[in-house]
């Protein structure tokens, strides 16, 4: 018996088709993915084969202005309109805290939302009981699959889930749900989460009876071949893992942003296991026509947000300074608003030890691309903050030991002068550059904010201890040189989209005036 | 207004066949998986056989695998039973259902009102 | 498959009664549970799904718990219109079962 998964994994709302990076679709003819080309191809093979699943691995939730303003509504609209079979739960679908998963997405989806290691407590448990599920049975032709699934037990720290969700451990929640559909004569077992690829791995050889694990989280790209984009492969599609018990278990992942999607050949036999598994990821590029339907629902939608750019958020009475000329040469305040913005939005995780779990930013001045003039009546829109952060990056959190962050504020300064966007603006930290001394060795002082203290202070930077640090996912992935970055990070979980972040903080601020405050010297 | 509409009922002899169709109107059809539910005399129910949106998955309750086939036409808004080899035992009201989702699984919130099916000599 | 074992099989409660009846699946069934209610010569109506979510327009009288093999239905104050037969089912793997159904009469 032969089964086709469709996958998509870390969508992140780019319901309508983006460049190849993944930013804002400017050339149609080159254009890429949104769901009305992935309806098309869905379809296709829907129509051609006959044994077909539509999984989706979680983070459909925030990315770009559709998430902004429909706040996960367009996800269950969508989705529903692309009949996805299941969805499992990814950290993003929290951003908005359980409400603004609960009713945008689990009451409205048609189909199952899954984890089966997050566990409801105290009012929330009859809340939303049946909300979300461990497993789900689906009848496939004549067959049934069963599809359990997982989200990483991080979440807490990446996103809002509140208090009342405990996120255990994926394996040691995984396991008796597995075993309960053994029970119910379901012999062929998808897991479908979003840990990231090395607990897909984990996950394939530790758990008994999974036969099959389609994951996210880690934006991973697989391919068996040569790759038809710019994506480097991680690995062979699927990439294959040998279980504790002996079985080779297929474990696959689509990249990201919809660009791709997953396809993969099972066959099974009668006992429900692998015999065969091949595939690849499809790049849904303009070769696939979209579907008119979807596109025109698509078109239908899009008047809201282009409503929303032009309303004011907040109001600035300073002038927010986000030249080139200020931000690569020196501390510019355009680049402590954003540094303020990127640390408020990761609030959260206090306790009577930490104030909270991270402190620091680092941002490259080159990312900041323009000004805000306060002239305008102080009004800041969504369509200012698109001018300043056009690039449709995000924040994310990274786990560096502090001889990296080091070498990282070295490379800062190691050409200065050159107005090039490696300079670093700042918060959290406290950064002396002595600039008569030889490149590499500039960095006089480096003092940041301590997180396990009643009362936050700058402390020396420690080169052994590990940091969380807060910055672009540009500078994560070694962007403008930061190559230490890249190589030398302990940990990188991708957070929300740039301009979010700085909207939600203005508007929440309501009035803003940053400062040049001695940060960088 | 929601409403399914059973058609296709009435007396048939052993061995024989029947075909129940089902209309569906005031929702879109094929956003839905659709069941057959049946009701002996004086008994309780007992699920036929279910449906998803595209008829790419279906389902049977053993007592009829082999003999009934369900089917549907999403261009038509109907959904229909083709009963063959019809047996005394198959004697029920025949119930239209909508499940609540487009998948199969989930749990039947429309209701028609029934064609009853007799199968005598 | 699945068996849905329903008690009692009818009862008899007096208006404003708080009823309950219990269904007992053969086999865990986390929360894939449903509750109907059939009135006699009408078509049965879905009260309650995933074992403790009301239905749309249902009142609130109605209400189901429980996960696993055990699930109980409840009645907080029984009304003259709640005369019927009530019926679990399991959603959780096809084919899908009905418990044998609860007749249930006004004293």
């Known amino acids: 018996w032969e089964l086709t998964i469709l996958h998509t994994n870390d969508v992140h709302s780019r319901l309508e088709q983006t460049s190849e990076d993944s930013s804002k679709c400017v050339n149609a003819s080159r254009c890429m993915g949104g769901v009305a080309r992935l309806f098309t191809k869905v379809q296709q093979i829907r129509r051609a084969e006959p044994n077909v699943l539509l999984l989706d691995a979680g983070d459909q939730y925030q990315g770009t202005i559709w998430f902004t303003v429909y706040k996960g509504a367009e996800v269950a609209h969508f989705m529903n309109a692309l009949r996805y079979d299941a969805m499992a739960l990814g950290n993003h679908e929290f951003d908005n805290g359980v409400e603004g998963l609960i009713e945008p997405l689990l009451k409205e989806a048609k189909f199952p939302i899954l984890s089966a290691n997050i566990k409801a407590k105290g009012p929330l448990a009859s809340q939303i009981s049946g909300l979300y599920l461990p497993y789900k049975v689906l009848p496939v032709g004549d067959e049934v699959v069963g599809i359990v699934g997982y989200t990483s037990k991080e979440t807490p720290f990446l996103s809002n889930p509140g208090t009342n969700l405990v996120f255990e451990d994926e394996i040691t929640a995984l396991q008796p749900e597995v075993d309960k559909l053994k029970t119910l004569n379901v012999n062929k077992i998808i897991a479908l989460g979003h840990s990231g690829f090395e607990t897909d791995k984990l996950i394939a050889q530790k758990v008994r009876g999974v036969d099959v694990v389609v994951g996210g989280h880690s934006n991973t790209f697989l391919y068996t071949g040569n790759p038809p984009s710019k994506e480097v492969p991680a690995g062979k599609y699927p990439f294959i893992v040998t279980s504790d018990d002996g079985r080779k278990v297929p474990v696959v992942q689509a990249y990201a942003f919809g660009k791709y999607l997953g396809y993969l050949k099972i066959e099974f036999d009668e006992r429900g296991n692998v015999i065969s598994s091949h595939g690849n990821p499809i790049l849904l590029n303009s070769s696939i026509p979209e579907d008119p339907s979807i596109k025109a629902d698509i078109n239908k939608w899009r008047i809201k947000l282009d409503n929303y750019s032009t309303q004011e958020l907040g109001k600035t009475i300073v002038y927010l300074d986000g030249s080139s000329q200020s931000c690569r040469f020196r501390e510019c305040n355009m680049g402590n608003l954003i540094c303020d913005a990127m640390i408020n939005n990761n609030l959260r995780h206090a306790d009577e030890m930490f104030w909270n779990h991270v402190s620091m930013c680092i941002l490259n001045g080159g990312g900041i691309r323009s000004p805000i003039d306060e002239r305008n009546n102080g009004t800041i829109t969504w369509e200012n903050l698109a001018a300043v952060l056009p690039f449709g990056g995000t924040f994310d959190l990274v786990q560096l030991k502090g001889s990296t962050l080091k070498k990282a504020f070295e490379h800062s300064v190691h050409r200065y002068g050159q107005s090039t966007g490696e300079f670093l603006q700042v918060g959290g930290i406290h950064v002396v550059y002595d600039l008569s001394r030889k490149p590499g060795d500039r960095v006089v002082k480096l003092d940041v904010l301590c997180t396990k203290c009643r009362v936050p202070s700058y402390d020396p930077l420690k080169m052994d201890e590990i940091y969380k640090v807060i910055l672009p996912n540009f500078l994560a992935n070694g962007g403008d040189g930061f190559q230490m970055i890249k190589d030398e990070l302990l940990r990188h979980d991708s957070g929300d989209q740039d301009i979010n972040v700085v909207s939600t903080y203005i508007s929440k601020m309501k009035v803003i005036y940053p400062a040049v405050e001695g940060r960088i010297k | 207004e929601v409403q399914l509409v059973e058609s296709g009922g009435g007396l048939v002899q052993p061995g024989r066949s029947l075909r129940l169709s089902c209309a569906a109107s005031?929702?879109?059809?094929?956003?839905?998986?659709m069941h057959w539910v049946r009701q002996a005399p004086g008994k309780g129910l007992e699920w036929v056989s279910g449906?998803?949106?595209?008829?790419?998955?279906?389902g049977y309750a053993d007592s009829v695998k082999g003999r009934f086939t369900i089917s549907r036409d999403n261009a038509k808004n109907s959904l229909y039973l083709q009963m063959n080899s019809l047996r005394a035992e198959d004697t029920a009201v025949y119930y239209c259902?909508?499940?609540?989702?487009?998948?199969?699984?989930?749990?039947?919130?429309?209701w028609g009102q029934g064609t009853t099916v007799t199968v005598s000599s | 498959d699945i068996q849905m074992t329903q008690s009692p099989s009818s009862l008899s409660a007096s208006v404003g009664d708080r009823v309950t009846i219990t269904c007992q699946a053969s086999q865990d069934i986390t929360n894939y549970l449903n509750w109907y209610q059939q009135k006699p010569g009408k078509a049965p109506k879905l009260l309650i799904y995933?074992?403790?979510n009301l239905e749309t327009g249902v009142p609130s009288r109605f209400s189901g718990s429980g996960s696993g093999t055990d699930f109980t239905f409840t009645i907080s104050s029984l009304q003259p219109e709640d005369i019927a037969t009530y019926y679990c089912q399991q959603s959780v793997v096809l084919p899908f079962t009905f418990g044998g159904g609860t007749k249930v009469e006004i004293k």
């Open positions: 259902a909508k499940d609540r989702r487009y998948g199969l699984t989930y749990g039947m919130d429309v």
């Open positions: 005031g929702f879109t059809f094929d956003d839905y998986a």
């Open positions: 449906i998803s949106w595209s008829s790419g998955s279906i």
């Open positions: 995933d074992a403790s």
